[in-house]
């Protein structure tokens, strides 16, 4: 159960971090039923590249990293719950 | 960039400090806290992602908290001493670009 | 967590002339360019100057350079101006963040 639970994890970080390479927003991937609230995920990766300079939104390398590195906590969180959820609603039938 | 909520508390008091924004989204941005005690440097605490995930400095030890909702960012300290007055900053993004003039919180008995 | 030890304040400099202040990391930062430098003037909270070891933030002269990589960087300011008279920090940032740090200042007197 463990390793399912760390494949959905690492597949759905990798979508996210497709997305975010595109320059989409989270928020879509939450609204689609992979998210919870954690804080909602309204994004510094809303914005096509080409805007981001202007509206003082760093692309540098440590930037990247750190929004991958909050990503792969908040779904670790997200997925985390729904899977004690699960078992927890598991336990009670 | 806007804080507040510093004042003079005892040792052992908890204090909540907020940052708010004008002239842009705060939800868009990773928001850090930087504090300076009086004389002294610059102490990094730590930040909050747009995702509302944390990263803390290691000398933190779960003593200090950051959240955040739509338009605030807060920072719930406890277990206080004489050792944590200082201004408390809040800036934004990663690279702390945009800066608040600080709070002030002074740990007194 | 990261130590960042800076040059020793205060350090003096002629209007007109060159200032470089030093800061050296215990260990590697992140991508050997995660660092950054502020600047700070009494009363006044600090001011990003550089990111990414050498990028000017927006709306900085570019009299300001950073340099460096890995453990060591340099911030330079040339045709330096009274202005300029301030406390400078060097920030590093980390693989994990609880290591992030910064400098404990270095002092810019303008004679």
């Known amino acids: 159960r463990r390793d399912v639970a760390h494949g959905i994890l690492n597949e759905a970080y990798r979508k996210v971090l497709d997305q975010l390479s595109a320059g989409k927003h989270l928020q879509s991937l939450v609204a689609r039923g992979v998210g919870g609230s954690l804080g909602g995920g309204a994004g510094d990766d809303a914005e096509p590249l080409s805007k981001r300079h202007s509206d003082g939104i760093f692309t540098d390398s440590y930037s990247r990293y750190r929004k991958q590195m909050a990503v792969k906590k908040y779904l670790a969180a997200v997925l985390g719950k729904r899977y004690k959820q699960r078992v927890k609603n598991k336990g009670r039938r | 960039v806007e804080e507040s909520g510093g004042r003079l508390v005892t040792p052992g008091t908890p204090l909540t400090l907020t940052c708010t924004a004008s002239g842009f989204s705060l939800s868009r941005y990773a928001m850090g806290w930087v504090r300076q005690a009086p004389g002294k440097g610059l102490e990094w605490i730590g930040d909050?992602?747009?995702?509302?995930t944390t990263d803390y400095a290691s000398w933190v030890n779960g003593r200090f908290t950051i959240s955040r909702t739509s338009t605030t960012v807060t920072l719930k300290m406890t277990s206080l001493t004489t050792e944590d007055t200082a201004t408390y900053f809040c800036?934004?993004?990663?690279?702390?670009?945009?800066w608040g003039q600080g709070t002030l919180v002074t740990v007194s008995s | 967590a990261a130590v960042l030890t800076q040059t020793p304040s205060p350090v003096s400099a002629a209007v007109g002339g060159t200032v470089t202040i030093k800061c050296q990391s215990s260990?590697?930062?992140?991508?050997?360019?995660?660092l950054a430098w502020y600047q700070q003037k009494p009363g006044q909270p600090p001011k990003l100057l550089i990111y990414a070891a050498s990028n000017l933030a927006s709306g900085v002269p570019d009299r300001f350079s950073g340099s460096g990589s890995g453990t060591q960087f340099t911030l330079t300011i040339s045709g330096v101006q009274c202005d300029d008279a301030a406390t400078y920090y060097c920030?590093?940032?980390?693989?994990?963040?609880?290591?992030?740090?910064f400098g404990g200042g270095t002092e810019v007197v303008v004679k």
């Open positions: 260990q590697s930062v992140y991508d050997n360019n995660a």
């Open positions: 909050i992602s747009t995702y509302g």
């Open positions: 800036a934004r993004d990663y690279w702390l670009s945009l």
């Open positions: 920030l590093g940032g980390y693989d994990d963040a609880a290591d992030n740090a």
